[in-house]
Interface confidence: low
């Protein structure tokens, strides 16, 4: 359905509040270094213009595309060249090239200071003084640090942020009420951002076929009672929503997401029995709830897959006539029967099935050739099962911090060229899989663990793409989306790596170490551990453990000393010398 004015159409559909929020997010994700006030000014100008178009859709410029309107607005920023350098060249291009250019300049690791949380009373005063500005600032700060954050979901986070302050700023103990809520929002927000980043990478690097395959598998697990045609419809709609959001078309994305939620709630009977409680909620909450809904129960009478996909003499005929639909149906049928498998495993199985049919359907006796295809799945299934089992045992034995350290050593040995901050960030997050997934029942462990690892490894891939330093990382990141995790798991010690020269400065610590939070202390120690491994990649676990134990003892001793700085100055060089000797 075409509209005379796209901007008026979206303003009317979304309402002023959501319209303004989404435009602010869009601008903040494109121009990540611009000050807050500049963005608010641009958003207000766009909103006023949208209102004139609502009043008269034939008014001047109202017929322009959203990309044209938003791009023109962004290109009015006076300091574009000084702040963004070559991104300013985007403004010389015409649409759609200009928008593509802006997208290519999104920075996954912007050079922005970490967000510091003020005192609770200061935050509550700011909230009460100007609630609207306070919430806009939240959208701006999150969006500029996470340029692929799922915009309609960010509006939901902002609503929860507002609710937390509204409740807790009136509480007797404001801090006890507010801080846990803010911690939860921060952790959930980081997870949401990383999950969406994988969806965008999937669409942008591997195409919508890859995303659709992921969606078929995931939705078939969630909605095993839904028919294939129903799942296909949801996949088509969901692909459109995420394509729009990943492409910066945030108004269309939010509008289409609302339509999808409406459709799902109107067609619950043919989708899932689990949607009911989501559908009673207001829009933002409803969409979030639908996205997170638990898997429905599997139908009791599902027949064996072998009849249609192995035993039938018509497998090759069906495959030849409709390859993607036939493979889609195979994936749907397999996924709805296996909520205990990770989506990535299901996609590997579909890929293996496709490869077998490609080979066998050209053979003299196709049926004989593909008769054992399901047997070939066994090693593919056992590999992630064993990986989860071994790593959960290690996690239970070591606890989270030491498990992270084991992964730090493992990954630094695999890809020592990667920057130390990236190795620390990624390995710490890989290590969180233990607490997240290992406590779950057996049937939920693999989908939790492997699909979470895919999200974390995607972060490594996007950071590495910005500054490529390792051919092995490039290979694992670009060859196959579904085989990224097995590719990284299979990497061994990089024998070609020339160890980093020892730099005493890297291992020099000061009294400020003592005032750090527990998390910050861990990061400091883990940074030192990565540097140690880069210096001595062949160091044994025992050697590294000895050095790290000495490090912990040295820090503890100096933090208890009366003159902390003097202790660090005196004991530091001794620790360095002892470490070098231990690793010699």
């Amino acid at each position: 359905d075409t509209h005379k004015s796209e901007v008026a159409h979206r303003f009317k559909d979304l309402g002023e509040e959501h319209f303004k929020g989404l435009v602010l997010v869009a601008f903040s994700q494109y121009l990540q270094q611009c000050p807050f006030e500049e963005h608010v000014k641009l958003v207000n100008e766009v909103t006023e213009f949208a209102k004139t178009c609502v009043a008269d859709e034939s008014a001047e410029n109202c017929d322009k595309s959203l990309h044209t309107l938003f791009g023109d607005k962004l290109c009015t920023v006076a300091t574009l060249r000084e702040t963004y350098g070559e991104m300013a060249d985007c403004c010389a291009k015409q649409e759609p090239e200009r928008n593509e250019c802006f997208l290519q300049h999104k920075d996954d690791n912007p050079n922005l200071p970490p967000l510091v949380r003020p005192e609770v009373d200061v935050m509550c005063t700011a909230f009460h003084d100007n609630e609207a500005t306070f919430l806009k600032k939240y959208l701006y700060e999150v969006a500029r640090r996470h340029p692929y954050f799922y915009a309609p979901e960010l509006l939901f986070f902002a609503a929860r942020y507002k609710a937390a302050f509204a409740e807790c700023c009136q509480a007797a103990d404001k801090a006890a009420c507010l801080l846990p809520k803010l911690d939860e929002l921060r952790d959930e927000g980081k997870a949401s951002s990383a999950k969406q980043r994988l969806k965008c990478a999937s669409l942008q690097k591997f195409g919508d076929r890859a995303f659709k395959a992921w969606a078929v598998a995931r939705l078939s697990q969630k909605f095993p009672k839904a028919e294939f045609a129903e799942v296909s419809k949801l996949v088509t709609d969901l692909t459109k929503v995420h394509t729009e959001c990943c492409h910066g078309d945030l108004l269309e994305c939010a509008d289409d997401r609302a339509d999808l939620a409406k459709y799902m709630c109107e067609n619950q009977d043919s989708i899932s029995s689990k949607l009911k409680e989501c559908c009673d909620k207001p829009l933002l909450e409803k969409s979030h709830c639908l996205a997170e809904v638990e898997n429905d129960e599997m139908p009791a009478d599902l027949p064996s897959l072998a009849a249609d996909y192995v035993e039938s003499k018509d497998v090759c005929k069906n495959y030849a006539e409709a390859k993607d639909v036939f493979l889609g149906m195979f994936l749907y049928e397999y996924a709805r029967r296996h909520p205990d498998y990770s989506v990535m495993l299901l996609l590997r199985l579909a890929k293996a099935y496709e490869a077998t049919l490609e080979k066998c359907c050209a053979a003299a006796d196709p049926h004989e050739c593909y008769a054992k295809v399901f047997d070939e799945f066994q090693p593919l299934v056992e590999e992630p099962q064993n990986l989860v089992k071994q790593n959960c045992e290690l996690f239970e034995q070591l606890g989270e911090y030491k498990f992270q350290n084991a992964l730090l050593v493992r990954y630094t040995k695999k890809v020592p060229q990667v920057s130390t901050p990236t190795l620390v960030e990624v390995s710490r997050n890989l290590g969180k899989v233990g607490a997240k997934c290992c406590k779950l029942p057996e049937a939920k462990r693999m989908p939790c663990a492997e699909d979470y690892l895919s999200v974390v490894l995607n972060r490594l891939c996007v950071l590495h793409e910005k500054t490529p330093v390792s051919e092995k990382v490039t290979k694992c990141c670009t060859e196959s989306l579904v085989n990224r995790r097995p590719c990284f798991s299979a990497l061994e010690l990089d024998e070609a790596y020339v160890p980093k020269a020892f730099n005493a400065e890297t291992f020099t610590f000061h009294a400020d170490m003592c005032t750090l939070s527990e998390k910050e202390k861990q990061v400091k120690k883990q940074t030192a551990l990565v540097e140690l491994v880069k210096h001595k990649p062949k160091a044994t676990k025992e050697q590294l453990k000895g050095v790290m134990d000495n490090f912990a003892a040295f820090v503890e001793k100096c933090c208890k000393a009366d003159d902390k700085e003097a202790c660090f100055a005196e004991e530091g060089p001794k620790f360095v010398a002892a470490s070098q000797a231990a690793l010699a």
């Epitope: 027949p303 069906n318 006539e321």
Partner: nanobody
Framework: EVQLVESGGGLVQPGGSLRLSCAAS????????MSWVRQAPGKGPEWVSA????????RYAESVKGRFTISRDNAKKTLYLQMNSLKPEDTAVYYC????????GSQGTQVTVSS
Amino acid sequence: EVQLVESGGGLVQPGGSLRLSCAASGFTFGSFGMSWVRQAPGKGPEWVSAIDSGGADTRYAESVKGRFTISRDNAKKTLYLQMNSLKPEDTAVYYCTIGRSTSRGSQGTQVTVSS
């Protein structure tokens, strides 16, 4: 998106006839083999008949051979099943599928054969 919508079912006496239709959309109908499948109350799905993409090659389950005829009109994106000499045991929900899968992809149309 892939959509298959069946019609033409109803209540008919033993020995009577019905013609089922299946309107397809969301995919290149003329490139796909199609099937009719049925599911009787309390039973699993049963494959009934299949036709290749061009309409030249047709197959039937033994239970319906000689009584049912599958056909298609690619220009109209429609699949048909002409059912003659109907028997009470033909009572079921009939639905069309892509390829020769017995996986339901649509809501189906009810056929009841009873005196």
